[in-house]
């Protein structure tokens, strides 16, 4: 018995930031769990991790170097990734590991959700405004 | 059939570390289904579980101890690790590993102990 | 922390005899009607072993002298007839929540 996971396909970081949700077929109400994002096709990189509890506040840590928050809902948790690169655009994939009570209960790999990391292009105002028109 | 069989205890000096290894078989500590867990036993007291990992590789903690513990495992040996830092003498125990299936987590297989005693 | 109870911490019984050994949980181990509380026997110098799982089922290759009940906070293991093997130690513990716990234990000696 697996949990299924829905991302956005894509999403696009214009000011690098983005919020990434993770919705799940399973309701995490009153459950013990460890939801995380992973970079990359392999999922090699653990991007952030939230960490639930019946009797704690939510845990929401990144041992990867990630500016990032997190917000439980009933059945999603959303990721919150701030300053973001250019070079981090990528494919990430949400994942959830239910612990307490048993079962134990994980999901099936998701489509992922590709997260495009648009730079900031500030123009500089000119120094000499050009002549205004009549 | 399922197998445990835990090795490296001994005496050691308070303030040390410990590494106590679990070699199972009969089953893949890789595979769905089934976790491990180590527990321990101060002479003559009761049972304190010290922590689980399961088959993704998702270590689990008992909150008083997790600030000395990390679990790990090698697939290849089909192993599982127990590293123990700063002991003290109230860390002399038998120290088990015990399988747990996922359904209910009652730990149906446990290996036969390892003594570990801390003193100086 | 989930603590649980036993009692009674010991208890000299005679073979044959019918043994019931209580277990409370601070709260309740019930979910979705299952209950997350598991019973084992252990003898000096051996591994606990175990012998009832989700408060009533039987564990397989233990006699069915062994049997369990209870739900929510309190739970029961019986032996309905003492046998020379029986006398050890037996403990309960919960799986409900995060950290799993355990009883002190209930010694069993021969009287």
């Known amino acids: 018995n697996k949990i299924l996971v829905k991302q956005s396909p894509m999403l696009v970081a214009y000011d690098n930031a983005v919020n990434l949700s993770c919705k799940y077929s399973y309701n995490l109400f009153s459950r013990e769990f460890r939801a995380s994002l992973h970079k990359g096709l392999d999922s090699a990189v653990e991007v952030c991790v939230v960490y639930g509890n019946y009797s704690q506040q939510l845990q929401v840590y990144s041992k990867t170097g990630f500016n990032c928050d997190g917000k439980l809902g009933n059945e999603s948790v959303t990721f919150y990734l701030q300053n973001l690169y250019v070079n981090q655009t990528d494919i990430y994939f949400c994942k959830i590991e239910v612990m307490y009570p048993p079962p134990y209960l994980d999901n099936e790999k998701s489509n992922g959700t590709i997260i495009h990391v648009k730079g900031k292009h500030l123009c500089p105002s000119p120094l000499f405004p050009g002549p205004s028109k009549p | 059939e399922v197998q445990l069989v835990e090795s490296g205890g001994g005496l050691v000096q308070p303030g040390g570390s410990l590494r106590l290894s679990c070699a199972a078989s009969?089953?893949?500590?890789?595979?769905?289904?089934?976790?491990v867990s180590w527990i321990r036993q101060a002479p003559g007291k009761g049972l304190e579980w010290i922590g689980s990992?399961?088959?993704?590789?998702?270590?689990y903690y008992n909150p008083s101890l997790k600030s000395r513990v990390t679990i790990s495992r090698d697939n290849s040996k089909n192993t599982l690790y127990l590293q123990l830092n700063s002991l003290r003498a109230e860390d002399t125990a038998v120290y088990y590993c015990?399988?747990?299936?996922?359904?209910?987590?009652?730990?149906?297989?446990w290996g036969q102990g390892t003594l570990v005693t801390v003193s100086s | 922390d989930i603590q649980l109870t036993q009692s009674p911490s010991s208890l000299s019984a005679s073979v044959g005899d019918r043994v019931t050994i209580t277990c409370r949980a601070s709260?309740?181990?019930?979910?979705?009607?299952?209950?997350?509380l598991h019973w084992y026997q252990q003898k000096p110098g051996k591994a606990p072993k175990l012998l009832i799982y989700?408060?009533?089922s039987l564990e397989s290759g233990v006699p069915s002298r062994f049997s369990g009940s209870g739900s929510g906070t309190d739970f029961t293991l019986t032996i309905s007839s003492l046998q020379p093997e029986d006398f050890a130690t037996y403990y309960c513990?919960?799986?409900?929540?995060?950290?799993?716990?355990f009883g002190q234990g209930t010694k069993v000696e021969i009287k």
């Open positions: 009969g089953f893949s500590l890789s595979t769905g289904g089934v976790g």
């Open positions: 015990a399988r747990y299936e996922y359904d209910y987590y009652a730990f149906d297989y």
């Open positions: 513990q919960q799986s409900y929540r995060s950290p799993p716990t």
């Open positions: 989700a408060a009533s």
């Open positions: 990992i399961y088959h993704s590789g998702s270590t």
């Open positions: 709260q309740s181990v019930d979910f979705y009607g299952k209950s997350f």
